[in-house]
């Protein structure tokens, strides 16, 4: 079981009883980690591992964990209040405009171009012309020296549904 | 092209009401979750609450929750938010927003979501 699991994240059916807690909704919503019954009346926990709610709600099932595809790692599992998080494998990355699959990144920069940046889970390798030190998409880096690529935005949960 | 238009913000006492509503271009509406978030002068964007593509059941910030209710029409492509029982930090321009493709089914951080509209401002004073 991983380290990042503690006793908050565990739905009460992990503590204790095995039967799903039931609660009552507060001003008509469920806190995270629950949904609402149908007649509105109880809240239940979602079961860990298998659902979830990150915000209150009143959604009728919790939301189902993402399963990691191939080619992703697992960051971090899928609790009763948080989805699993995924990231592209080492060699691979999730563009923003595209995130629904992890691509190759490129192996080495066009003819005129060095690299100036690495490939992360999040990113491509970055190239800039050597001459002018413009960047392949035609920005023009602040310093002219080398540029270091930054460690980027946090890991995002993955975005194929199992 | 997305094109996403708020309406509906203005200025209320604090207490009031106001329905913020956002008409969507795209014929992917129906089948999309969306969401409303906030941007008060000097702070971030924050999410307020997001609602399934079917309409049935939804996500609320703690900060609003029982204040404000979220709904969609999907024949009309219409997303609303009931605003009630207004503070002073509600005060903030409001933006409705349609998730990237593939993103979770119901997507609640500003990075989940590409297409926005333009906001509409809300200001809550006395």
């Known amino acids: 079981e991983s380290a990042l699991i503690t006793q908050q994240d565990l739905a009460p059916q992990q503590r204790a009883a095995p039967q799903q807690k039931r609660s009552s909704p507060s001003e008509g919503l469920c806190p995270p980690g629950h949904h609402i019954s149908e007649d509105g009346r109880d809240c239940i926990s979602c079961k860990y591992g298998q659902d979830y709610s990150t915000h209150w709600n009143d959604l009728l099932f919790c939301l189902r964990c993402t399963r990691c595809d191939s080619g992703e790692v697992e960051l971090s599992p899928c609790t009763t209040t948080r989805n699993t998080v995924c990231q592209c494998e080492e060699g691979t990355f999730r563009e923003e405009d595209s995130p629904e699959m992890c691509r190759k990144c490129r192996t080495g920069c066009p003819r005129g171009m060095v690299k100036v940046g690495d490939c992360t889970p999040w990113s491509d390798i970055e190239c800039v012309h050597k001459e002018s030190g413009t960047k392949h998409s035609g920005e023009v880096p602040a310093v002219e020296e080398t540029v270091t690529s930054s460690p980027g935005t946090p890991a995002s949960p993955c975005s194929l549904s199992g | 092209e997305v094109q996403l238009l708020e309406s509906g913000g203005g200025e209320v006492q604090p207490g009031g009401s106001l329905r913020l509503s956002c008409a969507a271009s795209?014929?992917?509406?129906?089948?999309?979750?969306v969401g409303w978030f906030r941007q008060a002068p000097g702070k971030e964007r924050e999410f307020v609450s997001a609602?399934?593509?079917?309409?049935?059941?939804?996500y609320y910030a703690e900060s609003v929750k029982g204040r404000f209710t979220i709904s969609k029409d999907n024949a009309k492509r219409t997303l609303y938010l009931q605003m009630s029982s207004l503070r002073a930090e509600d005060t903030a321009v409001y933006y409705c927003?349609?998730?990237?493709?593939?993103?979770?089914?119901?997507?609640?951080?500003?990075?989940?979501?590409?297409?926005w509209g333009q906001g509409t401002l809300v200001t809550v004073k006395p």
């Open positions: 609602i399934r593509w079917d309409g049935v059941g939804a």
């Open positions: 927003a349609l998730p990237r493709r593939g993103e979770s089914e119901l997507p609640s951080t500003v990075k989940e979501y590409g297409y």
């Open positions: 795209v014929s992917t509406f129906g089948t999309s979750p």
